[in-house]
């Protein structure tokens, strides 16, 4: 693994993809989605220590300023670098339609 | 302002663009950048309450699951939606060069 992918806090503690099992009710979708009834939601969770999966120059700056001024500048945070599309069968005024969402499930993660 | 832009926590508490004055030393750039000597770093800071500047469907999901499982799923976090480019005069082995960085200064912010 690249240096930027080795978590100094211990395995699984740093920014990475997690899967959370959720029902339509959990997601607040019960009133407008018919299928799926449950979703394996992939999302980015974990700490962003120095140099870990830094997305860009901005993330480097943010980390340096966070170390200097931790009360003013937060540490970078773990967010999706890209997404996997997902199709939903959703209720409409007249019935149902299929809609693909490109920004629903995280595919991989980085620190920004 | 749209509902998603009105901060329920009070003015200036939610995710927005902040400017932090930083020297080359602060940024850890003193050994490779000549100019500028100081930077007005724009970055995204602030809380991401429900429905505030949600970047996409994923952010909505994350907030709903955070309310259900706050110990497992973190709230969405405030990150750049886009960047402003910045030019640096940087030291090279033979002298100096000008380099434009597209991902250095946050231009606007959203919650992911």
């Amino acid at each position: 693994a690249r240096n930027g992918d080795r978590c100094p806090l211990g395995p699984g503690r740093c920014c990475r993809l997690h899967t959370v099992h959720a029902s339509l009710e959990d997601l607040g979708w019960a009133d407008w989605v018919l299928s799926p009834r449950e979703v394996q939601v992939t999302m980015c969770i974990g700490a962003c220590p120095s140099q870990f999966r830094e997305a860009n120059m901005h993330a480097q700056i943010k980390m340096n300023l966070h170390r200097l001024k931790p009360d003013t500048v937060p540490a970078p945070c773990c967010v999706p670098a890209s997404y996997n599309p997902m199709v939903l069968i959703q209720k409409t005024d007249t019935g149902v339609s299929l809609q693909t969402y490109d920004d629903l499930l995280a595919k991989d993660c980085h620190c920004v | 302002a749209r509902n998603g832009d009105r901060c329920p926590l009070g003015p200036g508490r939610c995710c927005r663009l902040h400017t932090v004055h930083a020297s080359l030393e602060d940024l850890g750039w003193a050994d490779w950048v000549l100019s500028p000597r100081e930077v007005q770093v724009t970055m995204c800071i602030g809380a991401c309450p429900s429905q505030f500047r949600e970047a996409n469907m994923h952010a909505q999901i994350k907030m709903n699951l955070h309310r259900l499982k706050p110990d497992t799923v973190p709230a969405p976090c405030c990150v750049p939606a886009s960047y402003n480019p910045m030019v640096l005069i940087q030291k090279t082995d033979t002298g100096v060069s000008l380099q434009t960085y597209d991902d250095l200064l946050a231009k606007d912010c959203h919650c992911v």
């Epitope: 299928s35 996997n84 599309p85 997902m86 199709v87 069968i89 299929l98 693909t100 | -």
Partner: antibody, heavy 118, light 107 residues
């Protein structure tokens, strides 16, 4: 615009292997929740579901035919394949592929006709 | 396997009439039933999902109802263009199974 099109040999002899291809456009099998199924219909008769493949490569088969069926996909080329080994005259039918998101076949191909005859 | 029975193989109706096509499941399938229309010489087209939800673009003359084991597709104000076979399908459990179909004839 979603389209699916089946292609096959048209005529086979008993005991031969049937290879069918479903070429589609307008959607991707890398999309979570998306699938493609194969359904057949003997002339003048009802519909019989054969197999289904999902975005995550999960595969389901009709138990009555499972030992003869293999479904696969090439996600990058937008194609799904069905292989039926050891065909018989009872396999004479029109074979359809259909987009099946969450078990709902909302778009169907035009069908390809197979005749099994010695 | 779950058997889907469409008791009527043929139904005859007139333009403007209302007709109901029925489908019975051999065991409880909740509302996990779809309906398809197949016009002569064509491939099937989706009409109804989850027993009662019209698929986008389907005229509101088509209405689905039922849950458990008994399901109905109702066509009101029948048009000559509705001449077709109508199939129910359960997707509650594998294998997916279809009814034998009901052919709608226009007098």
């Amino acid at each position: 615009q979603v389209t699916l099109k089946e292609s096959g040999p048209g005529i086979l002899k008993p005991s031969q292997t049937l290879s069918l291809t479903c070429s589609f456009s307008g959607f991707s099998l890398s999309t979570s929740g998306m699938g493609v199924g194969w359904i057949r219909q003997p002339s003048g008769k009802g519909l019989e579901w054969l197999a289904h493949i999902w975005w995550n490569d999960d595969k389901y088969y009709n138990p009555s035919l499972k030992s003869h069926l293999t479904i696969s996909k090439d996600t990058s080329r937008n194609q799904v394949f069905l292989m039926i080994t050891s065909v018989d005259t009872a396999d004479t039918a029109t074979y359809y592929c259909a987009r099946g998101a969450y078990d709902f076949f909302d778009y169907w191909g035009q069908g390809t006709t197979l005749t099994v005859s010695s | 396997d779950i058997v889907m029975t469409q008791a009527q193989n043929f139904m005859s109706t007139s333009v403007g009439d209302r007709v109901s096509v029925t489908c019975k499941a051999s065991q409880n399938v909740d509302t996990n039933v779809a309906w398809y229309q197949q016009k002569p010489g064509q491939s099937p087209k989706a009409l109804i999902y989850s027993a009662s939800y019209r698929y986008s673009g389907v005229p509101d003359r088509f209405t689905g109802s039922g849950s458990g084991t008994d399901f109905t597709l109702t066509i009101s104000n029948v048009q000559s263009d509705d001449l077709a076979d109508y199939f129910c399908q359960q997707y509650n459990t594998y294998p997916y199974t279809f009814g034998g179909g009901t052919k709608l004839e226009i007098k």
